[in-house]
Every structure is written in structure tokens, then in C-alpha cells.
Interface confidence: low
């Protein structure tokens, strides 16, 4: 049925889906706080622009009786049930902020006539790529994939003189939602990553991973995994590692590496960490440490979703344009808006762009140091440390296949 949108005559409402099944186990109260804080910023910005309008949020909670796994496994139906709830109440906002699980977002997008924008903190999977009215405010798997291919091909840096074409991927099925979809994208046989690599094998057992570390017959020196340093230690422990092994640890939503007092443990010396550049005001600030880093990024994405809506609302109102139109629904892309921590850029498909940072452990200082950065918007790598103090021979990353060319 056609649901009327509460989105005109100076009153603009945001529908926020508060789903029990979520990409991150963040208390819904924190997400509510983030949304309310975002609303207040939007009201202030609209007021400063001379736009005398009302902006509110309606929080839509699911009953939690059926879909209670708490993670994303049973999110598909929960999302549709919430949409049904909105439909029955005949109350839909100008924008839908909500589903963070790839399963639920994909299904909701498929099963609804989307004449309104959908903003997601999550929906990392490739199945949510290229959706015309979906905006994703946390780095999706496609962005990771493009970085990896770019980095694999790079061979003209002082510390990386070989192109790589092989990799192992460790994926044991216990990953967090973001890691699950990141690794899923690398595993998929039809993905860009798989297409560009000559050899790729997925390691699913701890023992497989552990054996590779010293296996003289291994087919690649490079292993990609996803998680934090503790996750790696649980798996690797203090086992010996062949000197030309490179572990790429994908840990995007974790800014602990940038804290002043952090020392890299010894087991991280063979590891390159891929993470996101922390926001402008995170370093050396009184930013609260009450939330874990990942949860902070999740709540921040909700908050930025509100600010994005405020940005678009302001533009359309200033231009005297209608909000309940396909034009508005399709407008949440190919733009930069003022986020909570500074400018946020969305690509042509509404996915957030960011600066990814590749870190290494300095053998001199035992600190994490920036090796290079990668701008997802232009798909370009920028070397930072031209003479890194690596653990690897000659302070260069090894070839990906042992015995191929000089080491």
C-alpha cells in the first residue's frame, strides 16, 4: 500500500529503524542518543540558514520476540516486519535510517518500492552495491577490495618492488558482521579481487592457518585476515613465522593504533594493519573512550546519517524543491557534507569514501607507523614512510611467492 510520508509543510520526520539484530552489539539507547544529538545539530544548522522548520525522528522498534539472535542472521525478516509496521501505521518519514545488516538491507531494498532514501550504518556486503536510493556510511566491502587490488599491483615503491598476484584468506565463520562481508567479498569467485588474482585459497581452520606460517610448500606468502590484534594472537600465538610471510590484518574501525601510549606486541611484527584514518578531532582530544572503537564508528554513522539528511533537506528547501520526490530519494550520493568530525564524501553510488591507512610495526620503536594511505575516492595510494624499519629483509616487502625473483 502507498504509505504517506510525514515530510512536508515545514515538518520533516526521519524514520529510524531500531533493530534487535544489528551489525554491532550497540545498546539502542546509545544509537538513540546519537540520533538525538544529530537532530539538534541539524536544527541549529537549519536555524542558522534562516529555515524555520521542524525536524524530528520516530524510532521504530521491533518486538524482538521472533528475531532475537541479536546478530545479523535473523535480520532479513525483522527489517521487513518493521517496514510492515510503518506501512500499517501509515507513517513514514522523509528518509529511512536503519538496517545495518546486509541481509536485511538487501531484502528491504528488493521488497519495497523505494521512493525515499535509505541510509545505512553497515550493509557491508557486495549485494548492497550500486543501489540507487541506498547510502552506506561505513566502508563497504567494495572499497576494501579496490584497495587490496591496488596494493597488490603496486610495484614502484621503495618498500614494495614486486607486484603480487596470490593470497591466502583466513575466514573461519566466527567473524563480526563487517569482517564477515569483507572476507566474503574476497572469497567470492566472481569478485574483482578474485578476478585480479592468479591464486587465492580460503583457510577455514585454525590449523590450516598455523601450518601455512612455516610451510615451505605454501603457494603464497600473503595472508589476509580480519579482526584486531587479540584475534590474531589467539590464532597465531607465539608460533614461529617464516621471514617472508606478510599478514594483512583488516581492522578498519579501530583507532587504538593511533593512541600515543600504544606499543605493538611482538607478534605483530610480520603484520600490516589496514585501518581507517581517525577523524580530525579524535587525536589528542578529550573524545570519550567509553565506547569501544568499533561501536563508536557505528554510532557515529547513525549520527552522520542524520547530518546527511539535514544537509539534503537544507539544499532542497533553499531551492524550493519538493522533498517527497524521486529526485530527493536519488540525491544522497556524489556529494560532500559536513559530518560530525569533518567533511564526509559519498561516491556516485552513495557509499562513504575514506582514507585507509596501512600500518607496520617499527622494529626500532615497537610502535605502529603509517606506511601508506589510500584514498578510496580516487583509488590512489600515497606512500608515507619511504624507508620503513620493517622486520622484512632489506626493509622491503617480500615477493608473494617464495623463490620468485631475489628476496
Amino acid at each position: 500500500s502507498q504509505v504517506s510520508q510525514n515530510c512536508h509543510n515545514g515538518s520533516y520526520e526521519i524514520s529510524v529503524l531500531m533493530m534487535g539484530n544489528s551489525a554491532f552489539a550497540e545498546p539502542l539507547k546509545n544509537l538513540e542518543d546519537a540520533v538525538n544529538e544529530g537532530l539538534e545539530i541539524v536544527r541549529g544548522r537549519l536555524q542558522n540558514a534562516g529555515l524555520n522548520v521542524t525536524v524530528n525522528a520516530t524510532f521504530m522498534y521491533s518486538d524482538g520476540l521472533i528475531h532475537n539472535s541479536g546478530d545479523c542472521r535473523s535480520s532479513t525478516c525483522e527489517g521487513l516486519d518493521l517496514l510492515r509496521k510503518i506501512s500499517n501505521a501509515q507513517r513514514m518519514g522523509c528518509v529511512l535510517i536503519g538496517p545495518s545488516c546486509t541481509y536485511s538491507t538487501f531484502q528491504m531494498y528488493l521488497d519495497t518500492e523505494l521512493s525515499y532514501p535509505m541510509i545505512s550504518a553497515g550493509s557491508f556486503g557486495l549485494s548492497c552495491d550500486y543501489k540507487e536510493t541506498l547510502t552506506r556510511l561505513m566502508s563497504p566491502a567494495r572499497k576494501l577490495m579496490y584497495f587490496l587490488v591496488n596494493f597488490w599491483k603496486t610495484n614502484d615503491l621503495p618498500f614494495k618492488t614486486y607486484s603480487w598476484s596470490t593470497s591466502y584468506v583466513y575466514k573461519n565463520g566466527t567473524e563480526t558482521e563487517d569482517c564477515f562481508w569483507y572476507l566474503n567479498a574476497l572469497e567470492a569467485s566472481v569478485s574483482y579481487f578474485s578476478h585480479e588474482l592468479g591464486f587465492k585459497v580460503v583457510l577455514r581452520q585454525d590449523k590450516e592457518f598455523q601450518d601455512i606460517l612455516m610451510d615451505h610448500n605454501r603457494k603464497s606468502n600473503v595472508i589476509i585476515m580480519c579482526g584486531g590484534p587479540e584475534f590474531l594472537y589467539k590464532l597465531k600465538g607465539d608460533r614461529a613465522v617464516a621471514e617472508d610471510i606478510v599478514i594483512i590484518l583488516v581492522d578498519l574501525f579501530n583507532d587504538q593504533y593511533f593512541e600515543d601510549n600504544v606499543t605493538a606486541p611482538d607478534y605483530m611484527k610480520n603484520v600490516l594493519v589496514l585501518t581507517l584514518s581517525p577523524g580530525n578531532s579524535l587525536l589528542n582530544s578529550s573524545f570519550s573512550r567509553n565506547l569501544s572503537p568499533t561501536k563508536r564508528d557505528f554510532a557515529l554513522a547513525y549520527l552522520n546519517g542524520i547530518l546527511l539528511f539535514g544537509h539534503m533537506l537544507k539544499i532542497f528547501l533553499e531551492n524550493g524543491e519538493n522533498i517527497t520526490t524521486p529526485k530527493f530519494a536519488h540525491a544522497f550520493r556524489n556529494l560532500t557534507f559536513e559530518g560530525y568530525d569533518g567533511p564526509v564524501t559519498l561516491d556516485d553510488w552513495g557509499d562513504v569514501d575514506s582514507t585507509m591507512v596501512l600500518l607496520y610495526t617499527s622494529v626500532d620503536t615497537k610502535k605502529y607507523k603509517v606506511l601508506l594511505t589510500y584514498d578510496t575516492h580516487v583509488n590512489k595510494t600515497y606512500p608515507v614512510d619511504m624507508s620503513p624499519t620493517f622486520t622484512w629483509k632489506n626493509s622491503k616487502l617480500p615477493n608473494d611467492i617464495t623463490g620468485r625473483g631475489p628476496q
Epitope: R43, G44, S286, F287, R289, L291, A299
Partner: nanobody
Framework: QVQLAESGGGSVQSGGSLRLSCAAS????????MAWFRQAPGKEREGVAV?????????TYADSVKGRFTISQDNAKNMLYLQMNSLKPEDTAMYYC?????????????????????WGQGTQVTVSS
């Protein structure tokens, strides 16, 4: 509409004291970062002190005023204050009250942030030697 109005500025001798006040109205939200900024002629605006409106605890001060200035509030009256003691000629500036809803969980304001959303008109403080 959030509105801020400062008062209490004036001229004072070096070593003297002043108390600035800021009356706030139009709040629609319970938590704000409340701050005092100052701008001396020909210089950039700088943060002096910041506090969270619903939290009597942690205030943050610029190094140049630590131990001399105290930020405080009276939530019942929606007032923000800046008690300035041991004033120096280099404290001469226009002083602004500012508010911003960007308070993170745990009630902290961002140190060093200058892009506050709401500003008062300012009150002049002149310290002569």
C-alpha cells in the same frame, strides 16, 4: 531558537578580576558543550574554557588560563559564567559565549573545537598594566 547573551566585560587593572556571564535561552536539548572563546585584535579566535551543560564535572581550560580562570554554570537559570582572576594585559580580547550539541557519550566535549553552532555577540575585556 538558541540565543546567547554575554555580559560582565569591562576595563580592569593587571592582577584584577572580572566575572563574565552568559544567559542562554531556547534550548531544545539537554546536553550542550558550553564554552568561552576570546579573540584579540588581529588574532584568531581561541578557546578559553569548555564544560558540558548537564555535567558539573570535567571542565577543560586553555593552558594560558589554567589556574586563573574558572568556568561554571547555573543550570536552573540557564547561565554560564567565567570567573577571571589574576588578569594580565594579554587577556585583553572580545570574549564570546558559545554552545554546541556535539557532546559525546560519557559527556565529553572536543578539546580544540572552534566550529561551535551557537554564538553570542561578545563582551569586551580590557586589562591595562
Amino acid at each position: 531558537q538558541v540565543q546567547l547573551a554575554e555580559s560582565g566585560g569591562g576595563s580592569v587593572q593587571s592582577g584584577g578580576s572580572l566575572r563574565l556571564s552568559c544567559a542562554a535561552s531556547g534550548y531544545t536539548y539537554s546536553r550542550y558543550c558550553m564554552a568561552w572563546f576570546r579573540q584579540a585584535p588581529g588574532k584568531e579566535r581561541e578557546g578559553v574554557a569548555v564544560i558540558v551543560s548537564d555535567n558539573d564535572g570535567s571542565a577543560t581550560y586553555a593552558d594560558s588560563v589554567k589556574g586563573r580562570f574558572t568556568i561554571s554554570q547555573d543550570n536552573a537559570k540557564n547561565m554560564l559564567y567565567l570567573q577571571m582572576n589574576s588578569l594580565k594585559p594579554e587577556d585583553t580580547a572580545m570574549y564570546y559565549c558559545a554552545a554546541d550539541p556535539r557532546v559525546w557519550y560519557g559527556g565529553t566535549c572536543r578539546a580544540g573545537r572552534t566550529d561551535f553552532l551557537y554564538w553570542g555577540q561578545g563582551t569586551q575585556v580590557t586589562v591595562s598594566s
